[in-house]
């Protein structure tokens, strides 16, 4: 019960997440005009990773798309791929996830191949999470060097009569949607790889001792009281519920969880 | 058509109040950031406030600050200019104006009179 | 606050002449954000409220004749009118739309000789 709410919570918040990288990825608020100790203007400007926009105190926004590849800053580049990435990886992450679920019943898909699977997004969570918080942070560590090296040449002018004012730039919305939904998507991805260490078969570096008896045979396993009976069809490798407990034939056929640690 | 109309200029004494009013229609009001324009004797043109279209934002040179106070009531497709403690200055003909494209004043009203006299 | 400073304070011109007007604001209104000019011309004649001509510095109001260019960046603007009409005698003004206060300059009076 305790696995299943884990990857379902896993599930939920890495879904809100990515839900978050997205909205992120396509707000225009990465970066927006500096209001502190500036001249009060009649026109707010904001950039986002795909253009830029102008808010006149009248109420008009104008907002133009970045049309050239070639001529943008490699940084910002670096940072649109991180996103994308982080994107992609979150989508397939979910997909895979969605299968992975416990509560979910495709065909006769074994636990330990859930576990593979919970295992799967769970890293895939992590890396979308930690590339997302890399772009978000690269982008604010160029706003930082842009602010404080514009701040040191804002007025410039001849005479002594100030004839520029430079615009400064500082954190926009998305910055904080990004750190905040890149950490709930690293949050999602451990949580499924908790749920995964739940969902795979317990096994031991020992191998499991077959003791036949009279009319029966009996399949022991180390560290536990739980076995499966030799008769009829239950011969072959067929799964017990309570506990996770799996034949000596079936606990081979499937990699342990110490495999992916 | 857009129509901007003034009421509520007249004659009064220094430090007195007036409230003046502007009546907007032929547009959506609601979405658009207004002004009071004044024009003194002298023909000089001064922004005396300017209200944002949500209300959030109103602007006042230092001469006004603090006596001067800009409102709307979008129900009523109203402006509002509150004036108080009034000086000769303060004469001049108040115009209700819209802001458009570039922040340009693109309707005016055709201005009311303030005479600020002992 | 920013000033507008307009030169000449007054044009006396004669009609079909080619007429310029200058303005120059004390700091920049270059918007850095969409490389826009905020300055703004109105035209007033006697008895009437202003007239918006043109906006962006640049850019001429609907209904506005072609006579009619705005020009300028930064902080030096000037206003042309390629043919004067008698109906375009009137009082320009040129106004800061880019720092708050949004200041207006003198005016240049434009009469007929």
């Known amino acids: 019960m305790a696995v299943t709410a884990c990857q379902g919570l896993g599930f939920v918040v890495s879904l809100i997440g990515i839900a978050g990288i997205i909205a992120a990825t396509c707000m225009d608020q990465w970066s927006t005009q500096d209001l502190y100790n500036n001249p009060v203007t009649a026109v707010f400007n904001y950039q986002g990773l795909w253009r830029s926009c102008v808010r006149e105190s009248s109420g008009f926004t104008e907002c133009r798309g970045y049309f050239t590849l070639l001529g943008l800053p490699a940084m910002l580049q670096a940072v649109r791929a991180l996103m994308i990435v982080g994107i992609v990886l979150g989508a397939i992450g979910l997909l895979v996830s969605i299968f992975a679920l416990k509560c979910i019943r495709i065909g006769s898909m074994e636990d330990s191949a859930k576990a593979n699977m919970t295992l799967t997004s769970g890293i895939m969570f992590i890396v979308s999470g930690l590339c997302a918080i890399a772009g978000v942070s690269v982008f604010a560590n160029m706003l930082v060097t842009n602010f404080w090296m514009s701040t040191a040449n804002m007025y410039t002018g001849m005479g002594g009569m100030v004839q520029t004012v430079q615009t400064r730039y500082t954190f926009g919305a998305a910055l904080f949607v990004g750190w905040v939904a890149g950490g709930l998507t690293l949050i999602g991805g451990v949580m499924m790889c908790i749920a995964c260490r739940g969902l795979a078969p317990e096994e031991t570096n020992y191998k499991a001792v077959s003791y036949h008896a009279s009319g029966h045979s009996v399949a022991y396993k180390p560290g536990g009281f739980k076995a499966s009976t030799g008769f009829g069809s239950n011969t072959k490798n067929k799964k017990i519920y309570d506990g996770g407990a799996r034949t000596e034939d079936e606990v081979q056929s499937y990699p342990s969880k110490h495999d992916y640690v | 058509e857009v129509m901007l109309v003034e009421s509520g200029g007249g004659l009064v004494k220094p430090g007195g109040s007036l409230k003046l009013s502007c009546a907007a229609s032929?547009?959506?009001?609601?979405?658009?950031?207004m002004s009071w324009v004044r024009q003194t004797p002298e023909k000089r043109l001064e922004g005396v406030a300017t209200?944002?279209?949500?209300?959030?934002?109103?602007y006042y040179p230092d001469s006004v600050k603090g006596r001067f106070t800009i409102s709307r009531d979008n129900a009523k497709n109203s402006l509002y200019l509150q004036m108080s403690s009034l000086r000769s200055e303060d004469t001049a003909v108040y115009y209700c104006?819209?802001?458009?494209?570039?922040?340009?004043?693109?309707?005016w009203g055709q201005g009311t009179s303030v005479t600020v006299s002992s | 606050d920013i000033v507008m400073t307009q030169s000449p304070s007054s044009l006396t011109v004669t009609a079909g002449e080619k007429v310029t007007m200058s303005c120059k604001s004390s700091?920049?209104?270059?918007?850095?954000?969409?490389?826009?000019?905020?300055l703004t011309w109105y035209q007033q004649k006697p008895g009437q409220p202003p007239k918006l001509l043109i906006y962006?510095?640049?850019t001429r109001e609907s209904g506005v004749p072609d006579r009619f260019t705005g020009s300028g960046s930064g902080t030096d603007f000037t206003l042309t009118i390629s043919s004067v009409q008698a109906e375009d005698l009137a009082v320009y003004y040129c106004?800061?739309?880019?720092?708050?206060?949004?200041?207006f300059g003198a005016g240049t009076k434009l009469e007929l000789k």
């Open positions: 106004q800061n739309d880019y720092y708050y206060p949004l200041t």
């Open positions: 032929g547009f959506s009001f609601s979405n658009s950031a």
């Open positions: 209200i944002s279209s949500g209300d959030s934002y109103t």
């Open positions: 962006w510095s640049s």
């Open positions: 700091q920049s209104l270059l918007n850095s954000g969409n490389q826009k000019n905020y």
């Open positions: 104006a819209r802001q458009g494209y570039g922040n340009a004043l693109d309707y």
